[in-house]
């Protein structure tokens, strides 16, 4: 469906508000260091240009592609070379290479200061003084820190952000109303960003076949009553949406996502009984609701899979005729029967089934060869079941902070070359799996835990790709998307690692420790723990626990002292000496 002017088409489809928001997100995700005002200026220029194209689609430049229009606009930024260095070289390229070049320069860990939350009264004043600017600033600040954030979903977050301020700035106790809502938006936003980053990594590093397989499994779990053809149509449409968003085509992505939501709501009867309440909502809320919708109930009369996929004499014939369709149907049938399995496990089973068919369909007696294929699934199923059960036991025994510490020690011993901030961030997030998943009933634990771990480990892979330091991490990240988590689980102590020399400065602390929030204190202590393990990778848990307990006692003592700085100066070296002796 071609249009004379793509920019006019998208402006009309999306409306001015969403158009401007999406262009701001796109520009902020590409030029992450540019000041807010610069982006607003660029967005306003693009918007004015779009309006001229709406008025006359034949006007000059209106026939240009969105990449050409947006790329040209980005390349007008005067400080491109000084601010972004070699990214400025992208501007010498023609489309589509120029856009690919911009995409490659997206920075998953931009050197930006952490967002500081002002006083509630200051925020409410800013909101009332200029609501539009206030909300644009939110889009800009989130987008530049999360360059793969799912753009239409970010508009939904911004709408919730606006609603929180509109409600709470009128409340008697503004802070009590607003702060929990902002905390929730922050935590949900970080989770949403990480989930989308995995989708983009899946598409960009492993191709759309990998993403489609993921989508078949997930949608079949969600919509077990839907026919395979229906699931396939949804998968095709969803793949297009995410391919566009991950490729920086945010206007097309948002437009196609709205079309997909419309289609799902018009075809509820053939998809799922759970869509009703989503479909009454306005667009942004509706799309979010559909994406998060709970699994429908499984049909009661599903037959055994063995008949079609093991016992049938036509297995090899059906496989040979259309391999991907046959495997897709197998994945669909398995997934709709197993909402209790993680998507990654389902994909491993499909991979194992494919490998068996590849081997057996070339054998003298194929049926005899693949007759026991379902038995071979058992160890693949037991591995994540055991992993989740053991980790939840450990979480329940230790509590979140100490569980994170256990993971910190384990991952530092596995990949000690990885930077300390990355190990702390990733291990803290791995540790959150306990609170998130262990309280759930047995049937929901594995999908919650393993699919969450996949998202967290993708963050490790993305950060490591930027600064590669470990062949083991590179191997686990690049060899197989579905086997990333088992690959990391199977890593053992790195015997080749040369312990880091002891640096007293790393273990020198000051009175500013006492004013930190509980979370910041934990991060400081966990940073010290990683450094300890890097220095003494063969230290036992008891030794490390002893040092950490002494550390907590030393900090607590000095934070209670009248002259805190003097206490840190005096007790610090004693703590360091005692720790070195304990680990000797």
């Amino acid at each position: 469906d071609t249009h004379k002017s793509e920019v006019a088409h998208r402006f009309k489809d999306l409306g001015e508000e969403h158009f401007k928001g999406l262009v701001l997100v796109a520009f902020s995700q590409y030029l992450q260091q540019c000041p807010f005002e610069e982006h607003v200026k660029l967005v306003n220029e693009v918007t004015e240009f779009a309006k001229t194209c709406v008025a006359d689609e034949s006007a000059e430049n209106c026939d240009k592609s969105l990449h050409t229009l947006f790329g040209d606009k980005l390349c007008t930024v005067a400080t491109l070379r000084e601010t972004y260095g070699e990214m400025a070289d992208c501007c010498a390229k023609q489309e589509p290479e120029r856009n690919e070049c911009f995409l490659q320069h997206k920075d998953d860990n931009p050197n930006l200061p952490p967002l500081v939350r002002p006083e509630v009264d200051v925020m409410c004043t800013a909101f009332h003084d200029n609501e539009a600017t206030f909300l644009k600033k939110y889009l800009y600040e989130v987008a530049r820190r999360h360059p793969y954030f799912y753009a239409p979903e970010l508009l939904f977050f911004a709408a919730r952000y606006k609603a929180a301020f509109a409600e709470c700035c009128q409340a008697a106790d503004k802070a009590a109303c607003l702060l929990p809502k902002l905390d929730e938006l922050r935590d949900e936003g970080k989770a949403s960003s990480a989930k989308q980053r995995l989708k983009c990594a899946s598409l960009q590093k492993f191709g759309d076949r990998a993403f489609k397989a993921w989508a078949v499994a997930r949608l079949s779990q969600k919509f077990p009553k839907a026919e395979f053809a229906e699931v396939s149509k949804l998968v095709t449409d969803l793949t297009k949406v995410h391919t566009e968003c991950c490729h920086g085509d945010l206007l097309e992505c948002a437009d196609d996502r709205a079309d997909l939501a419309k289609y799902m709501c018009e075809n509820q009867d053939s998809i799922s009984s759970k869509l009703k309440e989503c479909c009454d909502k306005p667009l942004l809320e509706k799309s979010h609701c559909l994406a998060e919708v709970e699994n429908d109930e499984m049909p009661a009369d599903l037959p055994s899979l063995a008949a079609d996929y093991v016992e049938s004499k036509d297995v090899c014939k059906n496989y040979a005729e259309a391999k991907d369709v046959f495997l897709g149907m197998f994945l669909y049938e398995y997934a709709r029967r197993h909402p209790d399995y993680s998507v990654m496990l389902l994909l491993r089973l499909a991979k194992a089934y494919e490998a068996t068919l590849e081997k057996c369909c070339a054998a003298a007696d194929p049926h005899e060869c693949y007759a026991k294929v379902f038995d071979e699934f058992q160890p693949l199923v037991e591995e994540p079941q055991n992993l989740v059960k053991q980790n939840c036991e450990l979480f329940e025994q230790l509590g979140e902070y100490k569980f994170q510490n256990a993971l910190l020690v384990r991952y530092t011993k596995k990949v000690p070359q990885v930077s300390t901030p990355t190990l702390v961030e990733v291990s803290r997030n791995l540790g959150k799996v306990g609170a998130k998943c262990c309280k759930l009933p047995e049937a929901k634990r594995m999908p919650c835990a393993e699919d969450y771990l996949s998202v967290v480990l993708n963050r490790l892979c993305v950060l490591h790709e930027k600064t590669p330091v470990s062949e083991k991490v590179t191997k686990c990240c690049t060899e197989s998307l579905v086997n990333r988590r088992p690959c990391f689980s199977a890593l053992e102590l790195d015997e080749a690692y040369v312990p880091k020399a002891f640096n007293a400065e790393t273990f020198t602390f000051h009175a500013d420790m006492c004013t930190l929030s509980e979370k910041e204190k934990q991060v400081k202590k966990q940073t010290a723990l990683v450094e300890l393990v890097k220095h003494k990778p063969k230290a036992t848990k008891e030794q490390l626990k002893g040092v950490m307990d002494n550390f907590a006692a030393f900090v607590e003592k000095c934070c209670k002292a009248d002259d805190k700085e003097a206490c840190f100066a005096e007790e610090g070296p004693k703590f360091v000496a005692a720790s070195q002796a304990a680990l000797a």
Partner: nanobody, 123 residues
């Protein structure tokens, strides 16, 4: 320091049984996850089974499930491995391991190890 000593290994015919013991000294084992690993000649050390602090949870490698049983007696500071229906492929040196937080199959999760006891299953 926790010390572990395995015993009970030996030569047995396929289909036979053995019971391995792991006696701990130096510390009470009640705070430790206990496990058995094995290492066949020329192969990596592999997880066999583990038991949590209370004995309420046990885990087994797929290859030994239904044939081997792990148990612990915290009062005697000892862990046991009952091995039934032994197969030639079970031939290996069997190691007892202990850790505060040990997680199943990861060799690196365990801080304390015994010297091992040889189990040979003849066909």
């Amino acid at each position: 320091q926790l010390q572990l000593v395995e015993s009970g290994g030996g030569l047995v015919q396929a289909g036979g049984s053995l019971r391995l013991s792991c006696a701990a000294s130096g510390r009470a084992i009640s705070s430790y996850v206990m496990a058995w690993f094995r290492q066949a000649p020329g192969k990596e050390r592999e997880f066999v089974t583990s038991i949590n602090w209370s004995g309420g949870s046990t885990y087994y490698a797929h290859s030994v499930k239904g044939r081997f049983t792990i148990s612990r007696d915290n009062a005697k500071n000892t862990v046991y491995l009952q091995m039934n229906t032994l197969k030639p492929e079970d031939t290996a040196v069997y190691y007892c391991a202990a850790d505060l937080y040990g997680l199943g199959y990861e060799v690196m999760s365990y801080d304390y190890w015994g010297q091992g006891t040889q189990v040979t299953v003849s066909s």
